[in-house]
């Protein structure tokens, strides 16, 4: 969480951003809130990016003002128009690109003053893993698949029964480049699986951590997946 203040006493307002991550090819949100104004006409929101000449986005006097917008963001940005009046300056970024990563500034002017805060935005790819029993294998085998990751993640297996056990010797992980030549499909196979146990396939890079669990008993198979972004720090 980053909290920024404007310059000098009563002419400053508090602006708060939260560091976040974007999943390339999907829509992302750059989060920013500010002390709200009572009327829309005096609110100006400017999003800027370090190293980019034009603006990322500008909203003023109740509407988007995109004449100074940088070409790389053309047609890809929007504020939540109904929430500006209550202090939400968050920016929706469509079709996140790898090159969207960097330091952004959320700059706010209201009738009460000015303020700004920076935001670190990471980009990559992350997806939920799915763990299945591989019935084609000669022994009891689990297969963990996740369709899109970047940068290349690490994959670690764990088990509820054998806590702390190292499964690297009995697992095999491969990374297959997807058609867009950036993200990769992650496939990890775990051999010599025992029945009545819960196994976890944990995939992690510097942006996200995802876990796929599978519980295998004689009568049923239960699955659960979970994904968490690692760098959601507020400013």
């Amino acid at each position: 969480l980053i909290i920024g203040f404007g310059i000098s006493g009563r002419h400053s307002i508090t602006v708060t951003t939260v560091a976040s991550a974007g999943n390339i090819g999907e829509d992302g949100i750059l989060s920013c809130t500010f002390e709200p104004d009572i009327k829309l006409s005096d609110i100006v929101i400017q999003w800027l990016k370090e190293g980019v000449l034009g603006l990322v986005h500008e909203f003023k006097e109740g509407k988007d003002e995109l004449s100074e917008q940088d070409e790389m963001f053309r047609g890809r940005t929007a504020v939540f128009a109904d929430q500006v009046i209550v202090g939400n300056a968050s920016l929706r970024l469509k079709n996140v690109q790898l090159t969207d990563a960097g330091t952004y500034k959320c700059y706010i002017i209201t009738s009460k003053g000015k303020g700004n805060a920076n935001l670190e935005y990471k980009t990559g790819a992350f997806s939920m893993p799915e763990v299945n029993v591989d019935y084609n294998a000669s022994s009891e085998t689990l297969r963990c698949e996740a369709p899109r990751w970047f940068p290349q993640p690490t994959v670690v297996w764990a088990s509820q029964v054998d806590q702390g056990a190292n499964f690297s010797e009995v697992s095999n992980t491969s990374f297959e480049l997807n058609s867009e030549n950036v993200t990769m499909k992650v496939v990890s196979v775990l051999y010599n699986v025992t029945i009545n146990n819960t196994y976890s396939c944990m995939i992690e890079n510097d942006i996200a951590k995802a876990t796929g669990d599978i519980k295998v008993t004689e009568s049923e198979i239960k699955r659960r997946s979970h994904l968490q972004l690692l760098n959601s720090k507020a400013s």
């Epitope: 002390e35 709200p36 009572i38 009327k39 829309l40 109740g62 500006v84 009046i85 209550v86 009460k112």
Partner: antibody, heavy 115, light 107 residues
């Protein structure tokens, strides 16, 4: 659940003052504007002003400036609207309403000004 | 001050009818218009903010459109529980101002 609970009905003499309270719960009181709106019988809704508890910023409708005073007690999450020099045309239901979208309203307080 | 002129002041329609209310601002308010529903003896309730955004929990039969000075509020299929007075309001500049209201009744 957001709730705004206002004080009870008041009967006042012309020239007197009235102070209406609005107790907020279910959200962070200091981070939203609190507006005051009145509705005289058969009249349109009329915005009187708003206060931002976190900073004490106040915006008044010029029509009421000098007669209306908006205050807050942040420790009690309560907003107050005081209207002075009352006249018969101030007879109305007075509402508090949360944030700049007026997303939640109090139940209203009837103020009757009569000699 | 920005005047908000609402019309009609009252209307009567049948259940299932499409109902349209208009609101005209005396100057450009961009899209800073909200619509409220008020039932007799009750406080107003926010239905639509920023011209067209339905507030949380508001049924999809309520919608809004417009920009600049001309705004429209629509009930696509009137229900018995929609009997109320509807108000437009601008939050573009202070003083914040409301329309005169439209009383909706069932035929």
């Amino acid at each position: 659940e957001v709730q705004l609970v206002q004080s009870g009905a008041e009967v006042k003499k012309p020239g007197a003052s009235v102070k209406v309270s609005c107790k907020a719960s279910g959200y962070t009181f200091t981070s939203s504007w609190m507006n005051w709106v009145r509705q005289a019988p058969g009249q349109r809704l009329e915005w009187m002003g708003g206060i931002y508890p976190n900073r004490g910023n106040i915006e008044y409708n010029e029509k009421f400036k000098g007669r209306v005073t908006l205050t807050v007690d942040t420790s009690a999450s309560t907003a107050y609207m005081e209207l002075s020099s009352l006249r018969s045309e101030d007879t109305a239901v007075y509402y508090c309403a949360r944030d700049s979208r007026f997303s939640y309203w109090g139940q209203g307080t009837l103020v009757t000004v009569s000699s | 001050d920005i005047q908000m002129t609402q019309s009609p002041s009252s209307l009567s329609a049948s259940v299932g009818d499409r109902v349209t209310i208009t609101c005209k601002a005396s100057q450009d308010v961009r899209t800073a218009v909200a619509w409220y529903q008020q039932k007799p003896g009750k406080a107003p309730k926010l239905l639509i903010s920023s011209t067209s955004y339905r507030y949380t929990g508001v049924p999809s039969r309520f919608s809004g459109s417009g920009s600049g000075t001309d705004f429209t509020f629509t009930i696509s299929s009137l229900q018995p529980e929609d009997i109320a007075t509807y108000y437009c309001q601008q939050h573009y500049s202070t003083p914040l101002t409301f329309g005169g209201g439209t009383k909706v009744e069932i035929k």
